[in-house]
């Protein structure tokens, strides 16, 4: 039902849901720090624009008595409970930041008359696509799917001369929240990825994955999985791998590949890593100093959520427009704003666009190198390394079907 918003007369409030169930196991204190850092920046920007207004955040905590798994499995009702709490207290702000779990976001969107914008650090699943008042500040599954299809079809690069139309997907149910929804999207029979591929099989057991590595009768040379190098090593170990196997390791929110002294372990030589291009200035931030790379992205999304609100607030105030309107609620899309770490672009549906980077391990240097980049905004792949020092024959990616092309 409609809830009155604390969002007028020069005072603008942001409601931040601090849920016990979260896409990443991040101490709520760190998210609070990120939000507060964002508020400081927003206040400064508004002041510089000559707008003398107050912007604050209200942190809404779940009691944690019922919904206490800590991950996203029991998040569905927690979000609605928090909304009820806000409603009872008549404390809704101009914008809602959180939740991050796909289940809770989907349910909250479904069960409420959302006349206010909702900003999420997460909500990766396809079920949260195309929501009119939802903005997602971490790459959703749809963006990954579009990259994969684009890359599979590419056949005009010096290092990839064959279109691919097949794949195995490894999904064993122990994935992190982001990986769970990424792989879920690839598995879904009605998804764009499944529609574009001629053959796709999901491997659910470790043994299935391990057997494929040397199976002469395998139906595809390509295996997609999600996680970090350690996750792959636990699964693959030092097992022999057929020379035309390509493992695509989706590890979007992990900066460890971009640390200067990192050497790629030997088991990564058959692997292409898909990750996000690293930011430039994050390391000096007070909220990110002690965070792991993934958590840095999560906290940064909260901070950028505050900056996005500040950006929209500034535009509407400068135009003399009302904030508590459907127009404001629907405005958080198809724009670029100044994020903490540079410009942030949102697509027509409010989802963040980014540059994805595909890395390979150089057989010469045992270092990670950029093979290509992919701009999610224009759905285009840009080759960077025209003569990669691959482990694969002739330094070209093999065909996806055994027995054809370079083996």
């Amino acid at each position: 039902s409609q809830v009155s918003q604390n969002c007028h007369n020069g005072s603008y409030e942001i409601s931040v849901l601090m849920m016990g169930n979260s896409a990443f196991a991040e101490p709520l204190k760190n998210l609070e720090d990120a939000v507060n850092e964002g508020l400081e920046i927003v206040r400064g920007r508004l002041q510089n624009a000559g707008l003398n207004v107050t912007v604050n955040a209200t942190f809404m905590y779940s009691d944690g008595l019922i919904h206490n798994s800590g991950d996203c499995r029991s998040s569905t009702c927690e979000g609605l409970d928090l909304l009820r709490k806000i409603s009872n207290a008549q404390r809704m702000g101009c914008v809602l930041i959180g939740p991050s779990c796909t289940y809770s976001t989907f349910q909250m969107y479904l069960d409420t008359e959302l006349s206010y914008p909702m900003i999420s650090a997460g909500s990766f699943g396809l079920s949260c696509d195309y929501k009119e008042t939802l903005t997602r500040l971490m790459s959703p599954a749809r963006k990954l799917m579009y990259f994969l299809v684009n890359f599979w079809k590419t056949n005009d690069l010096p290092f990839k001369t064959y279109s691919w139309s097949t794949s195995y997907v490894y999904k064993n149910g122990t994935e992190t929240e982001d990986c769970f929804w990424y792989l879920n999207a690839l598995e879904a029979s009605v998804s764009y990825f499944s529609h574009e591929l001629g053959f796709k099989v999901v491997l659910r057991q470790d043994k299935e994955f391990q057997d494929i590595l040397m199976d002469h009768n395998r139906k595809s040379n390509v295996i997609i999985m999600c996680g970090g190098p350690e996750f792959l090593y636990k699964l693959k170990g030092d097992r022999a791998v057929a020379e035309d196997i390509v493992i695509i390791l989706v590890d979007l929110f992990n900066d460890q590949y971009f640390e200067d002294n990192v050497t790629a372990p030997d088991y990564m030589k058959n692997v292409l890593v898909l990750t996000l291009s690293p930011g430039n200035s994050l390391l000096n931030s007070s909220f990110s100093r002690n965070l792991s790379p993934t958590k840095r992205d999560f906290a940064l999304a909260y901070l950028n959520g505050i900056l996005l609100f500040g950006h929209m607030l500034k535009i509407f105030l400068e135009n003399g427009e009302n904030i508590t309107t459907p127009k404001f609620a629907h405005a958080f899309r198809n724009l670029t704003f100044e994020g903490y770490d540079g410009p942030v672009t949102l697509d027509d549906w409010g989802d963040v666009d980014s540059t994805m980077v595909l890395l390979y391990t150089s057989v010469d240097t045992k270092k990670y190198k950029v093979l290509l980049t992919y701009d999610t905004h224009v759905n285009k792949t840009y080759p960077v390394d025209m003569s990669p020092t691959f482990t694969w024959k002739n330094s070209k990616l093999p065909n996806d079907i055994t027995g054809r092309g370079p083996q």
């Epitope: 971009f258 980077v357 240097t365 270092k367 950029v370 980049t373 960077v384 390394d385």
Partner: nanobody
Framework: EVQLVESGGGLVQPGGSLRLSCATS????????IGWFRQAPGKEREGVIC???????KYADSVKGRFTISRDNSKNTLYLQMNSLRAEDTAVYYC?????????????????WGQGTMVTVSS
């Protein structure tokens, strides 16, 4: 001795494309960061794109989405693909190299410079 030689400049209409090359010698591309710079008539030289030694491209906002960089180590050559060219892209384009202290960051300054190649965007 480190050498950089740019080529591929010329006259192109607005909205057109050009590909500049930077042929390098005297060093291994894997150990160097490479930058493309430009200097328009009467203006200061500005950075356009840098490619770190690890191969990570970093773009100036003015060219993002229009210009891309790639390298071919087997030919010791870098390429700057310029699409959707505008009149304000008219400049002398320089290739520059610096021994990399970081594999993923662009250096604050460059030690070696090419002679430049002129790009004119005009109808």
């Amino acid at each position: 001795e480190v050498q950089l030689v740019e080529s591929g400049g010329g006259l192109v209409q607005p909205g057109g494309s050009l590909r500049l090359s930077c042929a390098t010698s005297g060093f291994t591309l894997d150990d160097y960061a490479i930058g493309w710079f430009r200097q328009a008539p009467g203006k200061e030289r500005e950075g356009v794109i840098c490619l770190t030694s690890g191969g990570l491209p970093k773009y100036a906002d003015s060219v993002k989405g229009r210009f891309t960089i790639s390298r071919d180590n087997s030919k010791n050559t870098l390429y700057l693909q310029m699409n959707s060219l505008r009149a304000e892209d008219t400049a002398v384009y320089y290739c520059a190299a610096s021994g990399a202290t970081s594999r993923w960051n662009c250096p604050p300054q460059y030690d070696h410079w090419g002679q430049g190649t002129m790009v004119t965007v005009s109808s």
